[in-house]
């Protein structure tokens, strides 16, 4: 039985050229997290954090994606094309797979605030 809950940073905004932290947190389960995958809106993989072998950044994103903090992901040098959904997928044992969603809006405005709050989707 899957008892866990994924908390995410929810809907966030950041300005073009800046950076943003994508964060998910799995709670309410004793399951072992074996791997966390980060995917983009078109389901292309950004990064993997394997519990035993560590971080792997997809080659196409290695200049713009930084691992962490924690199991989160930092996107840098944001462009308007980065606007969209991001997914964290927690692979756990014995529970199985948990998935969280974050929506990132990249704003042109120089006064755009980076708003991030933890919320349950």
């Amino acid at each position: 039985m899957m008892t866990g809950t994924i908390e995410t940073t929810g809907n966030i905004s950041a300005k073009k050229g800046g950076s943003v932290i994508l964060q998910c947190h799995l709670s309410s389960t004793m399951a072992q997290v074996t791997q966390v995958n980060w995917e983009q809106h078109d389901h292309s993989l950004l990064a993997i954090r394997n519990a035993e072998l560590g971080w792997h950044i997809y080659p196409a994103f290695k200049d713009r994606v930084a691992p962490g903090p924690g199991l989160g992901l930092t996107l840098q040098s944001l462009t308007m094309n980065d606007t969209g959904e991001y997914f964290c997928t927690y692979h756990t044992y014995p529970d199985g797979t948990y998935r969280g969603r974050i929506f990132l809006e990249v704003l042109e405005s120089s006064v755009a605030e980076h708003s991030a709050r933890f919320q349950i989707p």
Partner: antibody, heavy 121, light 108 residues
């Protein structure tokens, strides 16, 4: 050219251990993951585990945890797979296979010739 | 773990004909999918990686497509040397990395 050369066939008794070697040549040994895959007679391919030759980190399939140990010797560009507490169901051909660079998990582009391990009383 | 399911288990095809092999993942593997060919008594050989990129030295009659959970390997015109067992594999979630059960392509 890039190649992986494995040690010769082994016949073992139930309860014993076997250690298979895989010597790499033709590329920078430390830069690519190495995997071990086995194939029982007439059966499909079964992944056993992976080792990062640069730093020695490993990840094993849960099925083999506690029985398998993967190590490497960077001075000879050789990886080893030791399987203990052998039983008849471990009779199989054991392959080493080169994976992607250690920055990203890739497909298995180079395979050893295979080592037949027979477990019989 | 991600379960890879291949179909059909056996495919009977005449030389010169087209062969289409399917592979389904129990959850998305993005494009991190490989196809291997194995002949009796030999080690597997990488054909396709990244779901659609041919490995070095692989003839153009082999092509791969798909992403997410549904993938296809197509052999446009079967040659005698193509009769073998074909395996798909995901390499994005581990442990364990997982293979499909294989599709045997045999002469009709």
């Amino acid at each position: 050219q890039v190649q992986l050369v494995q040690s010769g066939a082994e016949v073992k008794k139930p309860g014993a251990s076997v250690k298979v070697s895989c010597k790499a040549s033709g590329y920078t040994f430390r830069e690519y993951y190495m995997h071990w895959v086995r194939q029982a007679p007439g059966q499909g391919l079964e992944w056993m585990g992976i080792i990062n030759p640069s730093i020695g980190l490993t990840s094993y399939a849960r099925k083999f945890q506690g029985r398998v140990t993967m190590t490497r010797d960077t001075s000879t560009s050789t990886v080893y797979m030791e399987l203990s507490s052998l039983r008849s169901e471990d009779t199989a051909v054991y392959y080493c296979a080169r994976g992607g660079r250690t920055t990203w998990i890739g497909a298995f582009d180079i395979w050893g010739q295979g080592t037949m391990v027979t477990v019989s009383s | 773990e991600i379960v890879m399911t291949q179909s059909p288990a056996t495919l009977s095809v005449s030389p010169g004909e087209r062969a289409t092999l399917s592979c389904r993942a129990s959850q998305s593997v993005s494009s991190n999918l490989a196809w291997y060919q194995q002949k009796p008594g030999q080690a597997p050989r990488l054909l396709i990686y990244g779901a659609s990129t041919r490995a070095t030295g692989i003839p153009a009659r082999f092509s791969g497509s798909g992403s997410g959970t549904e993938f296809t390997l197509t052999i446009s015109s079967l040659q005698s040397e193509d009769f073998a067992v074909y395996y798909c594999q995901q390499y994005v979630v581990w442990p364990p990395l997982t293979f499909g059960g294989g599709t045997k392509v045999e002469i009709k």
